[in-house]
């Protein structure tokens, strides 16, 4: 469910939402750390209905959800965390 990507691209998110999305409707969460052309951390949520939304990393619910997923999966996430480094 959680994917972390390190890319050299500029920011992907034009607009961010803080509106809660229930876990069951989320297909994938992509985390883009700050740096490499983008000054902020970005979180992209891919939903079960094929739509995509950028979520404000400060939104309480996304922080809580990622923490819950990390805890509940106890070292193995339901989908592995992919770390891809592009020089």
């Amino acid at each position: 469910v959680l994917e972390v990507y390190y890319t050299s691209l500029r920011c992907r998110c034009v607009q961010e939402s803080s509106v809660f999305i229930p876990r069951r409707f989320i297909d994938r969460i992509q985390i883009l750390p700050r740096g490499n052309g983008c000054p902020r951390k970005e979180i992209i949520v891919w939903k079960k209905n094929k739509s995509i939304v950028c979520v404000d990393p400060q939104a309480e619910w996304i922080q809580r959800m990622m923490e819950v997923l990390r805890k509940r999966s106890s070292s193995t996430l339901p989908v592995p965390v992919f770390k891809r480094k592009i020089p």
């Epitope: 809660f20 876990r23 209905n49 619910w61 809580r64 997923l69 999966s73």
Partner: antibody, heavy 120, light 106 residues
Framework: EVQLAESGGGLVQPGRSLKLSCSAS????????MAWFRQAPPKGLEWVAS????????FYRDSVKGRFTISRDNAKSSLYLQMDSLRSEDTATYYC?????????????WGQGVMVTVSS | DIQMTQSPSFLSASVGDRVTINCKAS??????LNWYQQKLGEAPKRLIY???NLQAGIPSRFSGSGSGTDYTLTINSLQPEDFATYFC????????FGGGTKLELK
């Protein structure tokens, strides 16, 4: 007191359409995701569709995709399920339910159910 | 899609008994598992949410446990009003119910 009241059920021929309504009271309707579930004796309980707070996002079980449309009118505190191209396997009692609010709190409110029978 | 296999389908017990009902998911559901009770002609009523949290107003004789793919509902000291049908529901990825367990008086 929270109340969810479904209406619009009945007997309909295969291939025809029906629109279910759910009238909500006793809570701030627009603060909640809403859903339709159904129950048919041989198949047990099934989730049918869900809709986000403002109606901008909707989700469907595979077997109803392209045939059913979930919608809501927050001004009327009402939830709808437009059912087109009905099949005999859609025969069931349909329930309107609340899902999460903005904080992620997930209460347990169900309507009394409305019967839909698809038969020629 | 996630499948939920609930067992047993039928269960006979007496007042005062301790019973357990099991649900097995086809993949890890991260403890996003609820238990419901349903009586004839009524809507389902949630007993337990997210594996082990007791719904407000539900007696403490009901409890839930599990993780990963395997989950259990336990009813300690059955009361006459507990004879009903019980369902599990995963809400980790969309929703899937178990097939139900009909708990009958022996």
């Amino acid at each position: 007191e929270v109340q969810l009241a479904e209406s619009g059920g009945g007997l309909v021929q295969p291939g025809r359409s029906l629109k279910l309504s759910c009238s909500a009271s006793g809570f701030t309707f627009s603060d909640y995701y809403m859903a339709w579930f159904r129950q048919a004796p041989p198949k047990g309980l099934e989730w049918v569709a869900s809709i986000s707070y403002d109606g901008g996002d909707s989700f469907y079980r595979d077997s109803v995709k392209g045939r059913f449309t979930i919608s809501r009118d927050n001004a009327k505190s009402s939830l709808y399920l437009q059912m087109d191209s009905l099949r005999s396997e859609d025969t069931a009692t349909y329930y309107c339910t609340t899902e999460e609010d903005y904080s992620g709190s997930f209460p347990d409110y169900w309507g009394q159910g409305v019967m839909v029978t698809v038969s020629s | 899609d996630i499948q939920m296999t609930q067992s047993p389908s039928f269960l006979s017990a007496s007042v005062g008994d301790r019973v357990t009902i099991n649900c097995k998911a086809s993949q890890n559901i991260n403890k996003y598992l609820n238990w419901y009770q349903q009586k004839l002609g009524e809507a389902p009523k949630r007993l337990i949410y997210d594996t082990n949290n007791l719904q407000a107003g539900i007696p403490s004789r009901f409890s839930g446990s599990g993780s990963g793919t395997d989950y259990t509902l336990t009813i300690n000291s059955l009361q006459p009003e507990d004879f009903a049908t019980y369902f599990c529901l995963q809400h980790n990825s969309l929703y899937t119910f178990g097939g139900g367990t009909k708990l009958e008086l022996k």
